[in-house]
């Protein structure tokens, strides 16, 4: 999901002339940066979150906010800060003028700031048919964990918590934070209010249409009358969840955000922290027929992120929108039509429609999985998620076409039972942003902080790349793809898994000087192969040389191109045992495959040979995909020739502990 | 520990109204309405209705439509149900329970309408 | 309205017997059933909620079982304490109805 290349306005003030009064320049020379909102409409000028530096305590924060009430006074200017933050994020929000943010970014401690936007609700006024698995009749739907473990917050409008749908299984907190109704004339009418927080809550426990039965629920105000909330709101919202956490630790916490809005930095940052701080965090997609990773929180990594499909699998249209899509969706739910509580009268139901509705089915799966196994970090329920997921019955035409690749084609679904998971080696594909097409653009590809990336690969629509590496990063392994000279751009792909216990690390082979290419294995006792990745500095591999074929016999050794230099990824982890699986196509062909069986899980993706018109290659599922240049202007010569090589690895050490824990 | 207590007995003659009232405690009140059941002497037992704390709303059994009215004070976490133009077979142990799931009961007010 | 019908009426049993109450929607209530204890001159208590589970506090030999239409409250051995009138009730739609009840007696 989105990292560091949002698309939104970043303003950088580059402050260089010294403020009179200013006692303190920010360290190091660093100059703080401006953050707005990239759609107009929502922005809201007047109003500012000022992030400080992480380590900033909380009396430095309230000491920073008084330092630009004093400095901005001296100016003439009347400030008031509406609230300091500490618990998740340490900074302030303050109204001001915008005049003032020149001043505001040469405080001292000051990393960001961002000005105010809006979020939305994102709901348009069959569903347990599709995520039950075949084993329950959705018309009998009674989960075998109903999520009592848990408990589920709910970011949204106000709701009525007495509905017969809901009564006693949601709490409504004193939180709220609401920015005032649009327009002179509007009308507070209380069940327009509650409308849907109410739904969403009887989707995510309610006791005839809800999926998690069982799960308790704590509601806080974010959204008005309107469906309108506030960036800042959210924040706040937040760091209460964050406190509450800390004063009483309770079971797992399951976060539903079933608003969006505007990418935003500082509710992504806020996102992240409480993700780390052990809360699981579910937003919809949103309802903009968009990429996700223009929107927040949708676009933050740390967060299940979630599309809507409706009865048939398909994605939602809303009215002339739809739902969002690309790579900061993790997984579909359903989203159209769904049926729960609604606020008109205490017994009333109502169908809406959107990715709120699907955001509040996965909410009440992971209720589920973590009632059923409370231990579970975010990464082995996100890995759940997506493995239990039914997979590639989304028609992808009603996506863009170059959003069809980075869209996962998964949509949500109960396990079919909520035990005995544990022996499957998970991965998942983790896409990067795109490159951008300068000639030394690179894309970055990381997987979340307790996942291991196994493999890396690349992909590029016009076919020019320089391949891609594993690198360490800040003590992590990532995936950067190279663009090449000419190229649009590239994308780095991750395969990204749960190996508890591994040690793993990459093995380089510089380009060969022989024309029998370049190799390169894991030659460190007990080290299985896992991915192979190539990387060039030529503009173009030679296209003509015959394609590279593995010696027999040498299943832990990566192959590649002579002018290449190839990245062994080894690891070491109890009972880890992988083999390599390869399909050749002799004729030039857009699309070779290859799967790996039942039992085997896919953690490394790669083409033999490397050349210039091979597209690149990438995981879908447990198949490798490698994707070459349009039949018709590669001819049939030998360099059509293609191969797809899968590393299909297993665990039988999980497989033991799963056996003994039964 | 929740609680329902309800109003003190009531005697009342033919035609009159009666207001019973219900003080709940022990839980948040907005996160269950209140169901209000009776029982005639000897009898079984009668969904009269139910009524929200959260926003007032009321939702009745076809046979008492028009004649009782179930509201609620949030304040003070009071419900209230008032029966009016009483008739003899209005004679009844009157409960207050917890939500429309009905899983904590009121001790019971009894209402005699004799003339 | 949803027609609650409970047999039997009444019946007479021993300490220690086991005692089975049936009560039959007249349509489908999926599980929203409970069933109530009530002893003379007292407010009801609940003893099993939506169908099969027991709130906190009601003894084990309580039980309950059912979906759909048909139900059924087991006491597996009867107490002294437990001589009282039965009442099922659905709160799958309302209004919410009762059964008529069953009087268990000793014998």
């Known amino acids: 999901q989105e990292d560091e290349d949002g698309d939104y306005e970043e303003l950088v003030l580059a402050l260089r002339s010294e403020e009179d009064g200013l006692a303190e320049a920010p360290e190091h020379g660093t100059t703080a940066t401006f953050h707005r909102c990239a759609k107009d409409p929502w922005r809201l000028p007047g109003t500012y979150v000022v992030v400080l530096k992480e380590e900033t305590h909380l009396s430095q924060s309230e000491r920073t906010a008084r330092r630009l009430q004093a400095q901005a006074a001296r100016r003439g200017y009347l400030t008031k800060i509406l609230h300091v933050f500490h618990g998740l994020l340490p900074g302030f929000l303050v109204k001001m003028s915008g005049d003032l943010l020149e001043l505001a970014l040469k405080l001292p401690h000051v990393d960001y700031i961002e000005e105010d936007s809006s979020v939305f609700a994102q709901s348009i006024p069959w569903n347990l048919e599709r995520i039950t698995p075949p084993r329950y009749r959705a018309d009998e739907y009674q989960p075998p964990d109903g999520g009592s473990l848990v408990e589920v917050y709910l970011l949204d409008t106000s709701i009525q918590s007495d509905h017969r749908e809901i009564e006693g299984r949601v709490m409504v907190t004193d939180f709220e934070n609401v920015p005032e109704e649009d327009g002179t004339r509007f009308h507070r009418q209380a069940s327009k209010c509650d409308s849907h927080g109410t739904h969403l809550a009887g989707v995510v426990s309610g006791r005839d249409a809800g999926v998690a039965k069982g799960a308790s629920m704590r509601s806080l105000r974010v959204l008005n009358c309107q469906g309108k909330g506030t960036v800042s709101g959210t924040l706040i919202g937040l760091e209460f969840i964050r406190k509450s956490q800390l004063v009483q630790p309770v079971g797992p916490l399951v976060v539903l955000l079933p608003l969006a809005g505007g990418y935003s930095r500082v509710l992504n940052a806020a996102c992240q922290r409480l993700a780390r701080a052990g809360v699981v965090l579910v937003t919809a997609a949103g309802n903009f027929r968009d990429d996700a990773c223009l929107y927040s929180p949708a676009s933050a990594p740390e967060v299940i992120t979630v599309g809507a499909t409706n009865a048939q699998d398909q994605p939602v249209t809303l009215g002339t929108l739809g739902t969002n899509f690309g790579r900061c969706v993790d997984l579909f739910a359903p989203g159209e039509d769904i049926i729960g509580a609604s606020s008109d009268c205490s017994t009333c139901f109502v169908s809406q429609s959107g990715t709120s509705q699907a955001a509040a089915h996965v909410a009440g799966i992971a209720a589920m999985m973590l009632s059923a196994e409370p231990e579970l970090t975010l990464a082995e329920l996100r890995q759940r998620l997506i493995h239990f997921s039914a997979k590639d019955v989304i028609n992808e035409a009603w996506f863009p076409e170059d959003q069809r690749v980075l869209t996962p084609n998964l949509v949500a679904a109960l396990p079919p039972s909520t035990h005995g998971a544990g022996w499957q080696l998970f991965c998942r594909t983790v896409w990067s942003a795109h490159s951008g097409p300068t000639r030394m653009a690179t894309a970055v590809a990381r997987c979340a902080p307790d996942e291991e990336l196994l493999s890396c690969s690349s992909f590029s629509r016009s076919g020019k790349r320089r391949g891609e590496r594993m690198e360490a990063q800040g003590g992590k392994l990532v995936c950067r793809a190279h663009n090449a000279f000419g190229g649009e751009g590239v994308y780095a792909i991750a395969r990204c898994c749960l190996l508890p216990q591994a040690n793993c690390s990459v093995h380089t082979a510089p380009p060969a000087e022989a024309s029998m290419g370049t190799r390169v294995h894991c030659h460190q006792q007990g080290h299985v192969l896992t991915g192979c990745s190539s990387h060039w500095e030529v503009e173009d591999l030679g296209t003509h040389k015959p394609p590279v074929l593995r010696p027999r016999g040498q299943p832990n050794q990566c192959v590649g191109h002579r002018e290449a230099s190839i990245h062994a990824s080894c690891c070491h982890a109890p009972g880890l045992e992988c083999k390599v699986k390869e399909h050749g196509i002799p004729a030039p062909q857009e699309q070779v495959t290859v799967a790996c069986e039942e039992g085997w899980t896919l953690t490394g993706c790669s083409a033999l040979p490397g050349t210039s018109h091979v597209l690149g290659a990438y995981a879908v599922d447990n198949t490798c995909v490698v994707r070459s240049r349009d039949v018709s202007t590669t001819g049939s010569t030998s360099e059509g020739a293609v191969t797809a090589v899968a590393i299909c690895c297993r665990s039988r050490h999980l497989a033991q502990a799963s056996q003994e824990l039964q | 520990q929740v609680q329902l207590v309800q109003s003190g007995a009531e005697v009342k003659k033919p035609g009159a109204s009666v207001k019973v009232s219900c003080k709940a405690s022990?839980?948040?009140?907005?996160?269950?309405?209140i169901s209000w059941v009776r029982q005639a002497p000897g009898q079984g037992l009668e969904w009269m209705g139910w009524?929200?704390?959260?926003?007032?709303?009321?939702n009745y059994a076809q046979k008492l439509q028009g004649r009782g009215t179930m509201t609620t004070d949030p304040s003070t976490s009071t419900a209230y149900m008032e029966l009016r133009s009483l008739r003899s077979d209005d004679t009844a142990v009157y409960y207050c329970?917890?939500?429309?799931?009905?899983?904590?009961w009121g001790q019971g007010t009894t209402v005699t309408v004799s003339s | 309205d949803i027609q609650m019908t409970q047999s039997p009426s009444s019946l007479s049993a021993s300490v220690g017997d086991r005692v089975t109450i049936t009560c039959r929607a007249s349509?489908?209530?999926?599980?929203?059933l409970n069933w109530y204890q009530q002893k003379p001159g007292k407010a009801p208590k609940l003893l099993i909620y939506?169908?099969?589970t027991r709130p906190t506090g009601v003894p084990s030999r309580f039980s309950g079982s059912g979906s759909g239409t048909d139900f059924t409250l087991t006491i597996s051995s009867l107490q002294p304490e437990d001589f009282a009138t039965y009442y099922c009730?659905?709160?799958?739609?309302?209004?919410?109805?009762f059964g008529q009840g069953t009087k268990v007696e000793i014998k």
């Open positions: 329970a917890r939500g429309y799931s009905l899983d904590v």
């Open positions: 022990g839980y948040t009140v907005t996160s269950y309405g």
């Open positions: 009524v929200s704390f959260y926003n007032g709303n009321s």
């Open positions: 349509q489908n209530i999926n599980n929203w």
């Open positions: 939506g169908a099969s």
């Open positions: 009730q659905q709160w799958d739609d309302t209004p919410n109805t």
